[in-house]
Interface confidence: medium
């Protein structure tokens, strides 16, 4: 594994699956609030490769609710608010990482875990496939 | 604080900061490995609002490589393969968390963090504002 | 759909502490926290503060921070707001509101208060 | 603490008439803003979410726009049903904060 040069006043951790099981500080740092960012919440309906949003909870995982995005065409939105089927409106994927209660009930154990989420759509020029 | 249900199988915790600080087994258990999605992997040329990728590495933090995309023009591709301006390629945002060692250089003690990605983009309808 | 039912009006005397309870049906209770908020007789509506359920996590506004405890019970799916110290000026309808757990359009934790309790009234008066 | 102040502070309108609340935050809170109706001795029920997006159930009359600083709560052809107490809410910095409330009666 990988060697960190220490801090002195790291707290020790007895715990006989140490490096594996950590201490985790829950009282989660928001590194967002600075920038303020714009959130993206108005582009699901104006995108030309537009989704829905599904919810998907889980009330053994944090977070427990995930909203998934789909899109709603296959094709893009032209110029004239139809559907182009000449172009593919594709899913943008994204691992995110979730903390899953472990053992299940436990308020203060938790396993990292990885899902993958859509985050929302873009529309993509298609890979046609010739046949000889 | 939350009374919850309890496994007899959970871990103690006798840390004064409990609940704000848990046990989080970093054995990371992947979802996503049956479901074997199609990687978005180059979506990000074929999209009418293509993006470039790039990396953002910190080793205090969990995944300490994140790769953050930027949109490459203001507008999206048209047909003929021109930057048409009179509609936006914006990226889609995510927050995602993240573990940061705390203190610094502690190989067993992190605080949970969220932070705001760019995960792709995609081609919208701009807002026109009117000025009267 | 989640319904929020708080206990019954509370009359308490100066000094005294007042304990509201909060019952939630329908829906994970630890999909979502609770906040209470405040609304004196005529006046606009104050946050006191909120449990996270999923962490047990609690904040305080300010204001109340030393005189409120906010806890819940995951087996009874029940939260409670506990107010120590009561005066004429905590005479107040308080409610407890929803506080959705979710990572909604690509954002960890929405903090709408998509469901509120009926309401339960205090009146603080020697 | 974020200030949110709303404007008017009443408002008396004919049915049918459109209606515009403002709310401007003393500092920039993105899009963490929600709007809430509440009746005499009734709870406060959500209108709009994130300034912007709808709730299932809400009549589409019901619209919000802006970002940042600057927020508006537009019905579109009032009904008497509307005659309530709007309120603005952030979520953007603890502790929350809501505006000081708009009230819409019927003329």
């Known amino acids: 594994g990988i060697t960190i040069p220490r801090n002195p006043g790291c707290p020790n951790s007895e715990d006989k699956n140490f490096p594996r099981t950590v201490m985790v500080n829950l009282n989660i740092h928001n590194r967002n609030t600075n920038t303020n960012p714009k959130r993206s919440s108005d582009y699901y309906n104006r995108s030309t490769s537009p989704w829905n949003l599904h919810r998907n909870e889980d009330p053994e995982r944090y977070p427990s609710v995930i909203w998934e995005a789909k899109c709603r065409h296959l094709g893009c939105i032209n110029a004239d608010g139809n559907v182009d089927y000449h172009m593919n409106s594709v899913p943008i994927q994204q691992e995110i990482l979730v903390l899953r209660r472990e053992p299940p009930h436990c308020p203060n154990s938790f396993r990292l875990e990885k899902i993958l989420v859509s985050v929302g759509c873009t529309c993509v020029t298609p890979i046609v496939h010739h046949v000889a | 604080g939350i009374t919850i249900p309890r496994n007899p199988g959970c871990p103690n915790s006798e840390d004064k900061n409990f609940p704000r600080t848990v046990m989080v087994n970093l054995n990371i258990h992947n979802r996503n490995t049956n479901t074997n999605p199609k990687r978005s992997s180059d979506y990000y040329n074929r999209s009418t609002s293509p993006w470039n990728l790039h990396r953002n590495e910190d080793p205090e933090r969990y995944p300490s490589v994140i790769w953050e995309a930027k949109c490459r023009h203001l507008g999206c591709i048209n047909a003929d393969g021109n930057v048409d301006y009179h509609m936006n390629s914006v990226p889609i945002q995510q927050e995602i968390l993240v573990l940061r060692r705390e203190p610094p250089h502690c190989p067993n003690s992190f605080r949970l963090e969220k932070i705001l990605v760019s995960v792709g983009c995609t081609c919208v309808t701009p807002i026109v504002h009117h000025v009267a | 759909e989640v319904q929020l039912v708080q206990s019954g009006a509370e009359v308490k005397k100066p000094g005294e502490s007042v304990k509201i309870s909060c019952k939630a049906s329908g829906g994970s209770f630890r999909s979502y926290g609770i906040s209470w908020v405040r609304q004196a007789p005529g006046q606009g509506l104050e946050w006191m503060g909120g449990i996270t359920h999923f962490f047990g996590i609690t904040d305080y506004a300010q204001k109340f921070q030393g005189r409120v405890t906010i806890t819940a019970d995951e087996s009874t799916t029940t939260a409670y707001m506990e107010l120590s110290g009561l005066t004429s000026d905590d005479t107040a309808v308080y409610y407890c509101?929803?506080?959705?757990?979710?990572?909604?359009?690509?954002?960890?934790?929405?903090?709408?208060?998509?469901?509120w309790g009926q309401g339960t009234t205090v009146t603080v008066s020697s | 603490e974020i200030v949110l102040t709303q404007s008017p502070d009443f408002q008396s309108v004919t049915p049918k008439e459109k209606v515009t609340i403002t709310c401007r935050a003393s500092q920039n809170i993105g899009s963490e803003l929600h709007w809430y109706q509440q009746k005499p001795d009734q709870s406060p029920k959500l209108l709009i979410k994130?300034?912007?997006h709808s709730i299932s159930g809400v009549p589409s009359r019901f619209s919000g726009s802006g970002s940042g600083t600057d927020f508006t709560l537009t019905i579109n052809g009032l009904e008497a049903e509307d005659a309530a107490t709007y309120y603005c809410h952030q979520s953007d910095t603890l502790p929350h904060t809501f505006g000081q409330g708009t009230k819409v009666d019927i003329k």
């Open positions: 509101a929803r506080e959705p757990n979710d990572f909604w359009n690509g954002y960890y934790d929405t903090h709408d208060f998509d469901s």
């Open positions: 994130y300034a912007s």
